[in-house]
C-alpha cells in the first residue's frame, strides 16, 4: 500500500435543503484506470461510512441507488454532493481515495471537510 495526497475544503455549510457539495482532489501518481472514492463521517471519535463508489477513468461516478451521495469525476478530482442532511448530521466528512487498478495500490485520505447543517425554522402558520 502506497500513500497518496488528497485535498478537500476545510469547511462547507449545507444548504437550507440539507445539501452539501465539496471537491475531493487527489495527486494521482500514475495511470490509474479504476478508482474508488469513499466518504467517511467522523463524529465523537466514531467513524462511519457514508457512501462509496468505484469508477473507471472517463466514466461517470455511480453510487448505489439508495445512496445519499451523488458525484461527478473530472481527471483527478471528484465533485461530491451529499443530500438529506439534518442538523444531527453535522460532522467531519473525510474523503478516502483508492487507486484500485492497475497495481500498485494507492491509498489517500483527506483531512476532512467539516459540514455544518442547520435545520430550517418551520414556517409560521399564515392566514392566507
Amino acid at each position: 500500500c502506497k500513500a497518496m495526497h488528497v485535498a478537500q475544503p476545510a469547511v462547507v455549510l449545507a444548504s437550507s435543503r440539507g445539501i452539501a457539495s465539496f471537491v475531493c482532489e487527489y495527486a494521482s501518481p500514475g495511470k490509474a484506470t479504476e478508482v474508488r472514492v469513499t466518504v467517511l463521517r467522523q463524529a465523537d471519535s466514531q467513524v462511519t461510512e457514508v457512501c462509496a463508489a468505484t469508477y473507471m477513468m472517463g466514466n461517470e461516478l455511480t453510487f448505489l441507488d439508495d445512496s445519499i451521495c451523488t458525484g461527478t469525476s473530472s481527471g483527478n478530482q471528484v465533485n461530491l454532493t451529499i443530500q438529506g442532511l439534518r442538523a444531527m448530521d453535522t460532522g467531519l466528512y473525510i474523503c478516502k481515495v483508492e487507486l484500485m487498478y492497475p497495481p500498485p495500490y494507492y491509498l489517500g485520505i483527506g483531512n476532512g471537510t467539516q459540514i455544518y447543517v442547520i435545520d430550517p425554522e418551520p414556517c409560521p402558520d399564515s392566514d392566507f
Partner: nanobody, 126 residues
Framework: EVQLVESGGGLVQPGGSLRLSCAAS????????VGWFRQAPGKEREELSC????????DYPGSVKGRFTISRDNSKNTVYLQMNSLRAEDTAVYYC???????????????????WGQGTQVTVSS
C-alpha cells in the same frame, strides 16, 4: 481556453542540460496544474513530473527524480522543466499538459489532462 506551447528542446550531448518551457495563452496558468510527459518513437507516453497551481506541490516518478526539476512562474504564465545529466535514452518529444484544478495538487497520469501542447524534440547524442 488555455493553449500551451513548449520550447527549449534541441540537440544536447550526453551529460548536458536543457531547460524546457511551457508557455500558456488564452487563460491564466495559475488556475491549472501542469504536467510534463515525453514520448520516444515506438514507445508509450511517459510521465516525468507535475506541479500544482501554486507550485508548492510537485511530484516525480522514480525514473527521473534527482535529474529533472519542475518549477513555475505564474507571473510569466510559464512552467519549466530543468533536465540535467541527460542520457541518450532521454531522446523523445516532450509535451506539457494542463488540468484545471481547485486545490494545490497535481497528477502524473496522462489520463487526467485535457489540454496538451504540440511538443518539443529533445535529442541527446554525441
Amino acid at each position: 481556453e488555455v493553449q500551451l506551447v513548449e520550447s527549449g528542446g534541441g540537440l544536447v550531448q550526453p551529460g548536458g542540460s536543457l531547460r524546457l518551457s511551457c508557455a500558456a495563452s488564452g487563460d491564466t496558468l495559475e488556475s491549472f496544474a501542469v504536467g510534463w510527459f515525453r514520448q520516444a518513437p515506438g514507445k508509450e507516453r511517459e510521465e516525468l513530473s507535475c506541479i500544482g497551481r501554486t507550485g508548492e506541490f510537485t511530484d516525480y516518478p522514480g525514473s527521473v527524480k534527482g535529474r529533472f526539476t519542475i518549477s513555475r512562474d505564474n507571473s510569466k504564465n510559464t512552467v519549466y522543466l530543468q533536465m540535467n545529466s541527460l542520457r541518450a535514452e532521454d531522446t523523445a518529444v516532450y509535451y506539457c499538459a494542463a488540468e484545471r484544478l481547485v486545490f494545490h495538487l497535481c497528477s502524473l497520469s496522462e489520463y487526467d489532462y485535457d489540454t496538451w501542447g504540440q511538443g518539443t524534440q529533445v535529442t541527446v547524442s554525441s
